[in-house]
């Protein structure tokens, strides 16, 4: 029977008995920086080739005895899990293989560092197709690392590592931290993120996506024909590049932003039981474990958005957050996010001639979150159309003034430390879709676009009282671009996107004992793209 | 995902400009920066990665490489150049006593030292 | 191009222990082993076991266990598989192949067991 | 006694599609996805012409083609030719080993 592992993955409809991958990854190289492997292992012989790459430390401990056997373990196992013959995930992939981790599992930033460069070297010497570098390691937070994923990634390779074992903060580790790079966390078979001693798999906002780590059946270097169970986010992360060569395969055009942005978007959602994360971490870490997309074409015509976060901004007064979107994506919108409810708003601003999303904390705060919404829109043209406050009564309000620009996010921002709280809501008029409305002392942005044949609208939901959150979703076709929450209340902490919900958090009045009577209302800007949507359809 | 983490320790060394009258100075304004794994068991002290600034030649980076050593030998330090970076990012590794990371920090076109560290398995 | 070249024909009696060799060019040594397959006159083919050039490790098939012997000598890109203690069901023609896949075969040596 | 069954012989004429079955168990052919299929001409070594149920290496012709359901795994060769006239042998991974068909002989009906 199909490994737990496979069946995961595996959408429904492929399921059956007979189904065989078309090609599997067979246009696709993908490298591998771990130990050394047993390359003629009957699950990967002829698939894998071993590069003459080698930079490792010396074994600790003097009498450290190196058996081949013990060596080869944790890559035979992940080459495995990538293309093996019967476990692996991308049967038709071809990889090399450098070792820059010891018989213990040791290595250096300075010798993944030299195997990344090796990496490119060769792509320049002898251009191929689509490259995936599989980086099943990680140690503390390294800029150098950080900076040579991003050197890498910037040439065109797709690079996915393990998210980190150390049931802590991926943002704390490397190359986990490269926002360049897909980042995997790992999850079992129950869809629980999992659990490996005392530690598990790390969390947080630098984790793009989870994917089965535990229990993972795969090609053991203890024989020629046998096979092991390992757990740990490298096995994640083996599946995420085996997921990645199947897409570029069939794809072979996909840039790194498109793959990051299929992977999210056929991933299963909101499975992962979240109580296992802490509190904190809860918000940031996304709930998506990943799978094969249904079929191998004809996803081209959907509107691709994700959800960024910051970094935290820290207490201080002026602190401010940035949220940043990948240089082939369009920010959308900017929303901000407080767990004290003390912040003042968030600005889309240019920066190195590309739009950020900035959250600002308000005094007696502990920290805001900026929330990009980050999207691929072909041939956009995007601004920001900003309106100070306005202080009339009637609150605040920008539109998309010009011609075939459309309204996809609006954010609101304020100078004063505590808005109003005693003024009943604006609600938007009837009829005008494309303004944002905000509070009279703030200052408003609208995020207008023009790309062909891109329509959006408006949809709000509201609540007569806090009562934590407030959701609206977009239907089937459309594209959460946007998410924010109308003014006029002091409850409220913030708004974020989750896949394609708009959340708005507030304050629970029940438990805080307020009486207030203020609506909460969550506003979702939902797009779709005709333009895509007719291309798609004239290449089938 | 971004790389601004503040969680890893960073040591911004300043420029005593008496000292070395060899090393030409830095471009006015710009601190070279020494970072190394907030995670003390994993540290390799010893270790560097001298990272040089974006546009630099490989030729620079060798020549960096070398007034390092031959300041350092000025001094009494052995060093030990083990691999000049070219093709990703330019700069190189280094074999040294971390008393020279001040001089280091000095160099030419630097823009960063980093302090090697340990990576597992995971 | 990928070449497996296997030794000459042999003629033994039986008791005697036979060495066929089998060297192989052209490829990546390490990404393969080498598989040993005979077949005896009239009939099908029967899987004998394989040997790592990367490791030396040996997986032999249960039926010749304990009378088969491979070995490789990595110098020369050579295979040896050795047979002992030889009856006369084992003449048959002896081949190598490449991996468990036996994706290029050698062109086989012809091993006759007769008193 | 061979571990998987096959026909001991097939014939068709030239044209004409035939099918060689091999059948195992869910220790081999049901249980791995590495059936291949062999041709051999009367003197020569065999010849690789599917592998993983349904792949053909460079240079083997589409009219070869390969499947499998459950137990079963089956060669398909269409259009039958006079040089297709040879033994076909099926093997199969087991958990530790290799196993082989019996072989079954096509002739090509002149």
């Known amino acids: 029977s199909i490994p737990w592992n496979l069946e995961r993955i595996t959408p429904p409809r492929y399921r059956a008995d007979e189904y065989q991958p078309p090609d599997g990854g067979s246009l696709v190289e993908v490298y591998l920086l771990d130990t050394s492997i047993q390359s003629d292992h009957r699950e990967i012989e002829g698939r894998v080739m071993v590069t003459d790459f080698e930079n490792v430390p010396e074994e600790d401990g003097t009498r450290f005895h190196r058996q081949a056997s013990k060596c080869d373990s944790h890559g035979t196992h992940l080459a495995g899990v990538v293309s093996g013959r019967d476990a692996g995930v991308a049967k038709g992939a071809s990889m090399r293989s450098l070792r820059v981790l010891n018989c213990q599992g040791k290595g250096t930033v300075s010798g993944t560092l030299i195997g990344l460069e090796f990496i490119r070297k060769s792509q320049l010497v002898q251009p191929v197709g689509p490259l995936v570098v599989l980086l099943p390691l990680a140690g503390g937070y390294s800029r150098v690392l950080n900076a040579a994923c991003q050197r890498l990634a910037r040439a065109g390779v797709v690079l996915v590592t393990a998210a980190g074992n150390f049931r802590d903060d991926a943002c704390l580790y490397s190359p986990a931290s490269a926002p360049e790079v897909i980042t995997v966390g790992a999850t079992n078979a129950q869809d629980q993120p999992v659990t490996l001693g005392t530690l598990g798999t790390n969390f947080g906002r630098c984790v793009d996506l989870f994917a089965p780590g535990e229990d993972i059946i795969g090609a053991s270097s203890y024989c020629s024909t046998c096979f092991v169970s390992q757990s740990g986010t490298s096995q994640a992360a083996a599946h995420v590049a085996g997921i990645a060569a199947m897409m570029l395969s069939a794809e072979p055009e996909l840039t790194l932003a498109e793959l990051r942005q299929r992977l999210i978007h056929f991933s299963a959602k909101d499975v992962i039981n979240e109580a296992w994360f802490p509190e904190d971490q809860r918000v940031l870490t996304p709930n998506l474990v990943a799978a094969l997309p249904p079929s191998t074409h004809g996803a081209g015509w959907q509107l691709f958005c994700r959800t960024v976060w910051s970094a935290h901004s820290g207490p201080t007064r002026m602190a401010t957050a940035i949220a940043r979107c990948a240089p082939d994506e369009e920010l959308l919108s900017c929303s901000s996010f407080s767990r004290s409810g003390k912040r003042r708003g968030e600005r889309m601003e240019a920066q190195g001639g590309k739009l950020v999303c900035r959250a600002h904390n308000a005094f007696g705060g502990e920290g805001v979150y900026a929330i990009a919404r980050c999207c691929l829109l072909p041939q956009a043209n995007c601004s920001v159309h900003t309106a100070p406050p306005a202080e009339a009564s009637m609150g605040t309000r920008v539109h998309c003034h010009q011609q075939g620009h459309v309204l996809t996010g609006c954010s609101s921002h304020w100078e004063v430390e505590d808005l109003g709280t005693h003024k009943p809501p604006v609600l938007r008029p009837r009829g005008q879709p494309n303004q944002c409305v905000g509070h009279r002392e703030a200052s408003i942005h609208a995020s207008c676009c023009h790309a062909p044949g891109l329509e959006c609208k408006v949809k709000e939901h509201g609540i007569p009282a806090p009562q934590g959150q407030v959701t609206v979703a977009c239907e089937e076709g459309w594209t959460l671009t946007g998410c924010s929450a109308l003014p006029g209340t002091s409850h409220v902490l913030g708004a974020y996107a989750v896949d394609n919900t708009c959340v708005v958090r507030s304050r629970d009045v029940s438990t805080t004992g307020s009486t207030s009577e203020e609506a909460v209302t969550a506003v979702a800007i939902c797009c779709r793209s005709r333009h895509l949507a007719q291309a798609s359809q004239e290449l089938q | 995902q971004e790389d601004e983490d503040g969680d890893y320790e960073e040591l911004v060394l300043a420029l005593r400009s008496e000292e070395d009258g060899l090393a030409e100075a830095p471009e006015h304004g710009t601190t070279a920066t020494f970072h190394r794994c907030a995670k003390d068991p994993w540290r390799l002290p010893g270790t560097y990665v001298v990272v040089l600034k974006e546009e630099t030649h490989l030729s620079q980076s060798e020549r960096t490489a070398r007034r390092l050593q031959a300041q350092a030998a000025r001094r009494g330090y052995l060093t030990k150049i083990l691999h000049v970076f070219h093709g990703l990012l330019p700069g190189f590794l280094v074999k040294m006593s971390g008393d020279l990371l001040e001089l280091a920090l000095k160099l030419p076109h630097v823009d960063y030292i980093e302090e090697d560290s340990s990576v597992f398995a995971q | 191009q990928i070449q497996l070249v296997q030794s000459g024909a042999e003629v033994k009696k039986p008791g005697a222990s036979v060495k066929v060799s089998c060297k192989a060019s052209?490829?990546?040594?390490?990404?393969?082993?080498i598989s040993w397959v005979r077949q005896a006159p009239g009939q099908g083919l029967e899987w004998m076991g394989w040997?790592?050039?990367?490791?030396?490790?040996?997986n032999y098939a249960q039926k010749v266990q304990g009378r088969v012997t491979m070995t490789t000598d990595t110098s020369t890109s050579t295979v040896y598989m050795e047979l002992r203690s030889l009856r006369s069901d084992d003449t048959a023609v002896y081949f190598c192949?490449?991996?468990?896949?036996?994706?290029?075969w050698g062109q086989g040596t012809t091993v006759t067991v007769s008193s | 006694q061979s571990a998987l069954t096959q026909p001991a012989s097939v014939s068709g004429s030239p044209g004409q599609s035939i099918t060689i079955s091999c059948t195992g168990t869910?220790?081999?052919?049901?249980?791995?996805?590495?059936v291949s299929w062999y041709q051999q001409h009367p003197g020569k070594p065999p010849k690789l012409m599917i592998y993983?149920?349904?792949n053909r290496p460079s240079g083997i012709s589409n009219r070869f083609s390969g499947s499998k359901s459950g137990n079963t795994a089956s060669l398909t060769i269409s259009g039958l030719q006079a040089e297709d006239e040879a033994d076909y042998f099926c093997?199969?991974?087991?958990?530790?080993?290799?196993?082989f068909g019996g072989g079954t002989k096509l002739a090509v009906l002149r």
């Open positions: 192949a490449r991996g468990y896949g036996m994706d290029v």
């Open positions: 869910s220790s081999d052919v049901g249980g791995y996805n590495s």
């Open positions: 052209g490829y990546t040594l390490t990404s393969y082993g």
């Open positions: 040997i790592s050039f990367y490791n030396g490790n040996t």
């Open positions: 093997s199969s991974y087991t958990s530790t080993s290799m196993v």
């Open positions: 993983e149920v349904s």
